[in-house]
């Protein structure tokens, strides 16, 4: 039995998979900030987690996925005030009783030190300094991401 948030996450991910392949993204769109091989968009408005998830999807992006502690720190360095919380693409899966990224993978316990409870209707937010479990219905800001396509040097055969 999947929660409504899990269903929403799966539905959006499936619809994204169905869309036709687009050319790779070489540069970040206007208003998006480049962080290594990603483009990030920090919202100025607030939403519950599932609305944030949907908003990123409409922008042909996803809620932020964080690979490791290093990426977390670099993302946190872009947050301008300690009193701003941002949703990322991680929530508690009741069926698997574990933190689950919206791409279907589970959280490596060493990656993020989460402050707060791991329980139903809990979603993950980040601030300038920490990672928090908050109720998914809480209205806070969110971060969308787009992956940049690495530019490869073309090798032409001798003519």
């Amino acid at each position: 039995q999947k929660s409504s948030i899990e269903k929403c996450s799966v539905d959006i991910q499936q619809s994204r998979n169905k869309t036709t392949e687009r050319p790779g993204l070489l540069n970040c769109p206007i208003y998006w900030q480049q962080l290594r091989e990603k483009c990030l968009l920090f919202s100025h408005t607030v939403n519950p987690w599932n609305n944030s998830l949907a908003d990123c999807s409409t922008k042909e992006s996803s809620l932020l996925l964080i690979r490791d502690k290093d990426e977390l720190i670099h993302t946190q360095n872009l947050i301008r005030d300690k009193a701003i919380l941002f949703w990322i693409g991680l929530n508690f899966s009741l069926s698997e009783k574990n933190w689950k990224w919206i791409n279907g993978s589970f959280l490596n316990s060493n990656d993020l030190e989460i402050r707060g409870d791991a329980k139903e209707n809990s979603c993950i937010s980040i601030s300038q300094t920490s990672v928090y479990s908050e109720y998914c219905s809480t209205e806070i800001r969110w971060i969308c991401q787009k992956e940049l396509t690495p530019v490869r040097n073309k090798v032409y055969p001798d003519s």
Epitope: A83, R115, S133, S137, T138, I140
Partner: antibody
Framework: EVQLVESGGGLVQPGGSLRLSCAAS????????MSWVRQAPGKGLEWVSA????????YYADPVKGRFTISRDNSKNTLYLQMNSLRAEDTAVYYC????????????WGQGTLVTVSS | EIQMTQSPSSLSASVGGRVTITCRAS??????LNWYQQKPGKAPKLLIY???SLQSGVPSRFSGSGSGTDFTLTISSLQPEDFATYYC?????????FGQGTKVEIK
Amino acid sequence: EVQLVESGGGLVQPGGSLRLSCAASGFTFSSYAMSWVRQAPGKGLEWVSAISGSGGSTYYADPVKGRFTISRDNSKNTLYLQMNSLRAEDTAVYYCARGGYLPDAFDYWGQGTLVTVSS
Amino acid sequence: EIQMTQSPSSLSASVGGRVTITCRASQSISSYLNWYQQKPGKAPKLLIYAASSLQSGVPSRFSGSGSGTDFTLTISSLQPEDFATYYCQQTYSTPLTFGQGTKVEIK
């Protein structure tokens, strides 16, 4: 209907302690950041402290940092402010308000509770 | 810390009159500016949030404008119940700060 009701104010000597409470009803308490805001007699409004919906994240205004502690019990729909090492300049009406994480406005306020610090 | 400066500190106006209160931030705060009304012995009440959005239940005679550092609260036709003190507040950065207040009195 959203309601916030503060209690716990009173007269306390300098250096003393007091704990304020704010009972919330009419909304999903755990989904909202909450704040304390104070107003000294005849003066303007001063933000004191805020706490996230889960209670995991807190922050404070410089004049109260290290002396005041904000907390919440979501099972009781109650917000608290533990005030230690009280000073005369802490004398004010203390309001609890819904909101407190940027860019929240304070959309609902309690009626306030008066804290008087005097010997 | 961002300083918020309101002007005037007080004003006298007649019922039916138009009132304008200004608020200036010491640095740009985008549109993260709220306006509150407070009557003696009562808690503040949110009127306007995000510089120009009217809070639910607030009469349409109240309006807000501005962005960056300069903001305005306008009461288009002052009513007897509008005599009160008005505060601006920024929610751009911590600490959250308020203006010193503008008292609107009956002429």
